[in-house]
């Protein structure tokens, strides 16, 4: 093949070497960058800054060297359009440091640095923990901080992400109310920090005040669904990002629902309660307390992780016609208190058939909320007996 | 123990070039930084540049850009500061010192070079 | 480059005085540097990384402070502790120095 003339040439069939001494001095406008997955670049003394723009049209690059060349500043968000990229190499350039940001979101798998004149500070944090880690090939490049000694030996018993501190109110909050979140922010080289109120919805209208290093955050109008969600503050510097959640407990009364009884592997009579705070259960059996034992006990199913509203079963363990009756869910909390009712019958009582009548041999549940409702009989050709123990 | 000592005064002309050595001894030479910093007569301490004696890397501060090469001799243990174009806002003591890494701050100086640029 | 202030620039005090000098930095920096100079001498190194004494160092001296407001406490001001102080930053490139705290005698 003849020389390639240009500044950047084909290499293989995704790739392009950029190596013509001072030839470039951004990537803008790189031929066939749609499909590129790797980009070899060499000696550009005039490449001193990479940022969003230059990267842009470049989804499939894997492999990026930008080596030998004058690159001082790499912006945080300048690999934000290559979210595959899985090799980085800017060995032997003029950066001093490299934001953490810069990194995260990528999945590198080698990450070369050596030959810059990094300066060790709290922003280099994070390689120094992936050299400690063993992380993207970083330990056995030794890296040096210019002027002082090993990125290994940088002491960092200052380099923390901030500390975040969310004050939420003590007092009960009714549904209506206003609340005020104010969220404060502690450490070094405070960056950017913030709310992140993607559950919230509907939930409460959303007004934002202050800054760093105090951000406050009033939810007026505050309605049930607020409950359980969660109300995330967050903060970044240099060294990386804090998020702190909360919840608002928003008070409301109990409610309660039941449903119709189903067979299972036990039995189980479905119900709903819902209430904050979350409301204290009782059942009636036909009026009366029902105590529960190991034949007849209440379940809950694994709560959702963002709503109040609890499921579960009262979980009868093979009833029989004694359990058949009037089952009522009593739900309290300080704010109000509900109840619900449900008829199951499970098993038609063995001693009130006629001798003449057919044998009934299998029954479908009726479960109402009336007291009426006859078993469904199944008439056999061939007649048997049928004994029942009563428990 | 870890000494460094620098060579004797020197009174230059304006225009003209200085080199100051400073001798190091009690540690592994090739291993820490070496800064150089300087001090105008009743004024306080600025930076000049550091080299690193295992591979000659060095930079130095903006101010000194295209006057000042750090050089080191690895094996006589010596590094060097020229400042060339000598003017008389020059004159000062330099001093060299070590960049301590294990502790991570200037452990031990020079005892200083007085440097006068006069006419 | 970060600028460092000290406060005050000089001072007259007594032996057996508690001296305190301040250095604050232009932006926040991770650890601070003290360092104490004689006529005619080098400087010497008194606190490294803010609150750490330095070998031969004695306990009347100490450091404290973070992001950009520093301390240097001399507990009880000793004969030899007649000196000027400064202090410095290399959390970002290039280090630098403050202008210097001149403790003088009353």
């Known amino acids: 093949a003849a020389p390639c003339p240009d500044a950047c040439c084909p290499h293989g069939s995704s790739g392009l070497r950029c190596t013509r001494d001072g030839a470039l001095d951004s990537l803008h406008h790189l031929p066939g960058a749609e499909n590129l997955t790797e980009l070899y670049i060499e000696n550009q003394q005039h490449l001193q800054h990479l940022e969003l723009r230059d990267l842009r049209g470049l989804g499939e690059l894997r492999n990026l060297t930008i080596v030998k060349s004058g690159l001082r500043f790499v912006a945080p968000d300048a690999f934000h359009f290559t979210p595959r990229l899985s090799r980085l190499n800017l060995s032997f350039n003029a950066l001093e440091s490299l934001s953490w940001k810069t990194v995260q979101g990528l999945s590198l798998q080698e990450l070369v640095l050596s030959g810059n004149p990094l300066h060790c500070s709290c922003a280099l944090r994070w390689l120094q923990r992936w050299e400690e880690e063993g992380l993207g090939g970083v330990p056995e490049q030794k890296l040096q901080c210019h002027g002082q000694g090993p990125l290994a030996h940088m002491p960092n018993a200052s380099c923390g992400v901030p500390t975040l501190k969310v004050q939420v109110p003590n007092a009960s909050v009714d549904v209506g109310d206003d609340v005020l979140l104010r969220c404060q922010v502690e450490g070094r080289g405070l960056e950017q920090a913030g709310w992140i109120l993607t559950e919230l919805e509907q939930s409460a209208t959303v007004m934002k005040s202050g800054g760093l290093p105090s951000l406050g955050l009033t939810l007026a109008n505050v309605t049930s669904d607020l409950n359980r969600k969660n109300v995330t503050c967050w903060a970044e510097n240099d060294v990386g990002r804090a998020e702190v959640s909360v919840q608002v407990n928003v008070s409301f009364p109990a409610s309660v629902q039941l449903h119709t009884a189903v067979e299972m592997h036990h039995w189980c009579i479905p119900f709903s309660v819902d209430g904050q705070p979350a409301p204290s259960l009782r059942w009636l059996f036909n009026g009366s307390v029902l105590n529960e034992t190991s034949f007849i006990f209440t379940e809950f199913l694994e709560p959702a992780a963002n709503e109040t509203v609890r499921h579960g079963c009262l979980r009868l363990n093979q009833p029989t016609h004694v359990n058949n009756g009037n089952y009522t869910l009593l739900a309290a909390n300080p704010f109000g208190q509900a109840s619900a009712s449900i008829m199951a019958a499970f098993m038609d009582n063995p001693f009130e058939f006629n001798p003449e009548d057919p044998i009934p041999v299998s029954f479908s549940p009726v479960d109402t909320n009336s007291t009426s409702g006859d078993p469904v009989e199944k008439k056999d050709e061939t007649p048997f007996g049928v004994s029942v123990a009563v428990g | 123990q870890v000494q460094l000592v620098q060579s004797g005064a020197e009174v230059k002309k304006p225009g003209a070039s200085v080199k100051v050595s400073c001798k190091a001894s009690?540690?592994?030479?090739?291993?820490?930084?070496m800064h150089w910093v300087r001090q105008a007569p009743g004024q306080g301490l600025e930076w000049i540049g550091t080299?690193?004696?295992?591979?000659?890397?060095?930079s130095n501060a903006q101010k000194f850009q295209g006057r000042v090469t750090l050089t080191r001799d690895t094996s006589t243990s010596t590094a060097y500061m020229e400042l060339s174009s000598l003017r008389s806002e020059d004159t000062a003591v330099y001093y060299c010192?070590?960049?301590?890494?294990?502790?991570?701050?200037?452990?031990?100086w020079g005892q200083g070079t007085t440097v006068t640029v006069s006419s | 480059d970060i600028q460092m202030t000290q406060s005050p620039s000089s001072l007259s005090a007594s032996v057996g005085d508690r001296v305190t000098i301040t250095c604050r930095a232009s932006?926040?920096?991770?650890?601070l540097y003290w360092f104490q100079q004689k006529p005619g001498k080098a400087p010497k190194p008194l606190i490294y990384?803010?609150?750490n004494l330095a070998s031969g160092v004695p306990s009347r001296f100490s450091g404290s402070g973070s992001g950009t407001d520093y301390t240097l406490t001399i507990s009880s001001l000793q004969p030899e502790d007649f000196a000027t102080y400064y202090c410095?930053?290399?959390?970002?490139?290039?280090?630098?120095f403050g202008g210097g705290t001149k403790v003088e005698i009353k």
């Open positions: 010192t070590r960049f301590y890494y294990e502790d991570w701050y200037f452990d031990v």
């Open positions: 009690g540690y592994t030479f090739t291993t820490y930084w």
């Open positions: 410095q930053q290399y959390h970002s490139y290039p280090p630098t």
């Open positions: 990384r803010t609150s």
């Open positions: 080299i690193y004696p295992g591979n000659s890397d060095s």
């Open positions: 932006s926040s920096v991770s650890y």
